[in-house]
Interface confidence: low
């Protein structure tokens, strides 16, 4: 006999945890799970810790097909194998002045003033067989030491001259001291390279392209460069435009046109000249005046200026 | 400074057993995983298993289960595989790896299994 | 186990040019600690494999800078920017987010 509400195995679905139902006949069904799941409706979180990765002292918490690591204090990281840094978190764990170097699992101590031992409160010199030159200062790292150099030592073990006290580095280069073998390294300020930074770079020669703007000449200069610039243009790489208009040149109200490198004055009825300076009587036209002046401004525009003239652009 | 060095080549027949190693220096010993991985000539290599040097724990991938057996002896900070049951698909370079930022960071500088029939 | 995609599987190429070599995995490699536990190494013949990226882009101690990695999720790139003649062998990535550890089938980086 049929039911106005028969019993359909997959709706609703069954399967937990995101499983996928799939009917097997008129009453059965089957879940298919997730990773990570098992179980005939997939309630069952699969245990992923046997035989974990977690490491010293790490404890492992089952995840959804994964498990992840609880960590003791000193240790971090996904598999508790990577180091935390104690002298950040605990900043008195050295006593009497101690400074702190994070170890592996923990931290130990560079004591000062005879002070030594773990947390430098007892007499235990942790650099006692350490090859620092005399009069270097001994650093216990994690299954090593370092060697604080005084003024003119240099190396791993202090053991070289510092070839830095003579001052071989020019024009305030930085210098460094090559730990391996007591050569200076220079790094140069800009505008000079070589060994000892006393050779010029050559700027001009430099970049494909011109430093200067608007076709200006570069001129090298010992550190340095510099731009000699078309007329009309101004600033240290010539980048900007003058506007000649800006001192007021063409007279009797006279319209001033800006040019590359020029002027033109769009003059009055009754006035010509490059300036509109002329008064005439007559009707003439003023256009050749005009062309005139565009000419002026064109020769000009050929040559370099000597220096750089500083004029401020509107 | 960190290093792992392997027991040199071995030629084997079908069915026995070898035991390869693998002696850390460098690091403290019971702080890292160290790893098995196989490589086949012309392959990418392929994780076999670990050992938990301070505790003993393995893992494996299933691919390798009954086919390795990993031990360490702590004493000589030794990490060592035995393949058994050996047939010609085991030959393969098999490489012995430091765990570390979750990754293999150091490696042995591999032993050559070759299986014959 | 996650499916790890290396492509291209051979690269020729200019000493001096770039590289770019991609790996892309089944699923994300994003854990639950929020880690991206994706790795790169290169083979060189005749050689054990190196670690040169750890996690996603952090480059292991020694690898020139040269060397960078990137990505997220199930896209990842390593990128060598001036190929030098060490540079020559295979390139592999490895997941370890999840369990087994997965290599990639490889990249062969080899003089055009």
């Known amino acids: 006999a049929g039911s106005d509400n028969p019993y359909v195995p997959c709706a609703p679905s069954p399967c937990v945890n995101g499983g996928t139902c799939r009917q097997t006949g008129d009453f059965t069904f089957e879940c298919s799970c997730l990773p990570g799941f098992e179980g005939s409706t997939c309630e069952r979180n699969i245990d992923d810790c046997p035989n974990h990765r977690c490491q010293n002292g790490g404890v492992c918490v089952d995840g959804v097909n994964t498990y992840n690591c609880r960590c003791p204090p000193q240790w971090t990281g996904q598999f508790c194998t990577e180091d935390v840094d104690e002298c950040l978190l605990q900043p008195n764990a050295c006593q009497n002045g101690g400074t702190c170097t994070n170890r592996n699992g923990g931290y130990g101590c560079v004591c000062v003033n005879g002070w030594s031992g773990d947390d430098c409160s007892e007499n235990i010199d942790d650099c006692a067989f350490a090859s620092c030159t005399p009069g270097s200062t001994c650093i216990d790292r994690v299954a090593s030491f370092s060697c604080m150099c005084p003024e003119g030592k240099a190396g791993l073990l202090c053991h070289l001259d510092d070839a830095c006290i003579s001052n071989p580095c020019h024009k305030g280069a930085l210098c460094d001291t090559n730990p391996l073998n007591g050569h200076y390294i220079c790094t140069c300020p800009q505008g000079y390279k070589g060994a000892d930074c006393t050779e010029d770079v050559d700027e001009c020669a430099m970049t494909n392209s011109n430093p200067c703007e608007h076709a200006g000449k570069c001129v090298n200069t010992d550190g340095a460069f510099h731009c000699e610039c078309l007329k009309g243009y101004a600033g240290p790489r010539c980048e900007m435009d003058i506007n000649e208009c800006h001192s007021d040149p063409c007279q009797n109200d006279a319209t001033c046109l800006d040019k590359i490198g020029g002027f033109t004055c769009l003059c009055m009825p009754g006035f010509k000249g490059v300036h509109c300076e002329i008064e005439i009587n007559e009707g003439n036209s003023g256009l050749n005046d005009i062309f005139e002046a565009q000419k002026i401004e064109w020769h000009e525009n050929l040559y370099f200026q000597g220096h750089h003239h500083h004029h401020h652009h509107h | 400074q960190v290093q792992l060095q392997q027991s040199g080549a071995e030629l084997a027949k079908s069915g026995s057993s070898v035991k390869i190693s693998c002696k850390a220096s460098g690091y403290t010993f019971s702080n890292y995983v160290i790893h098995w991985i196989k490589q086949t000539t012309g392959q990418a290599p392929e994780w076999t298993g670990y050992i938990i040097p301070g505790s003993g724990g393995t893992k494996f991938n299933e691919k390798f289960k009954g086919k390795a057996t990993l031990t360490v002896d702590k004493s000589s900070t030794t990490a060592y595989m035995q393949l058994s049951s050996l047939t010609p698909v085991d030959t393969a370079v098999y490489y012995c790896a430091r765990d570390g930022a979750g990754s293999f960071t150091y490696w042995g500088q591999g032993t050559l299994v070759t299986v014959s029939s | 186990d996650v499916l790890m995609t290396q492509t291209p599987v051979s690269l020729p190429v200019s000493l001096g040019g770039q590289v770019s070599i991609s790996c892309r995995s089944s699923?994300?490699?994003?854990?639950?600690?929020?880690?991206?536990?994706l790795h790169w190494f290169l083979q060189k013949p005749g050689q054990s494999p190196q670690l040169l990226i750890y996690?996603?882009?952090n480059r292991f101690s020694g690898v020139p800078d040269r060397f960078s990695g990137s990505g997220s999720g199930t896209d990842f790139t390593l990128k060598i920017s001036r190929v030098e003649p060490e540079d020559l062998g295979v390139y592999y990535c490895l997941q370890s987010t999840h369990f087994p550890d997965t290599f990639g089938g490889g990249t062969k980086v080899e003089i055009k």
């Open positions: 996690r996603i882009s």
């Open positions: 699923q994300s490699l994003v854990h639950s600690d929020g880690n991206t536990y």
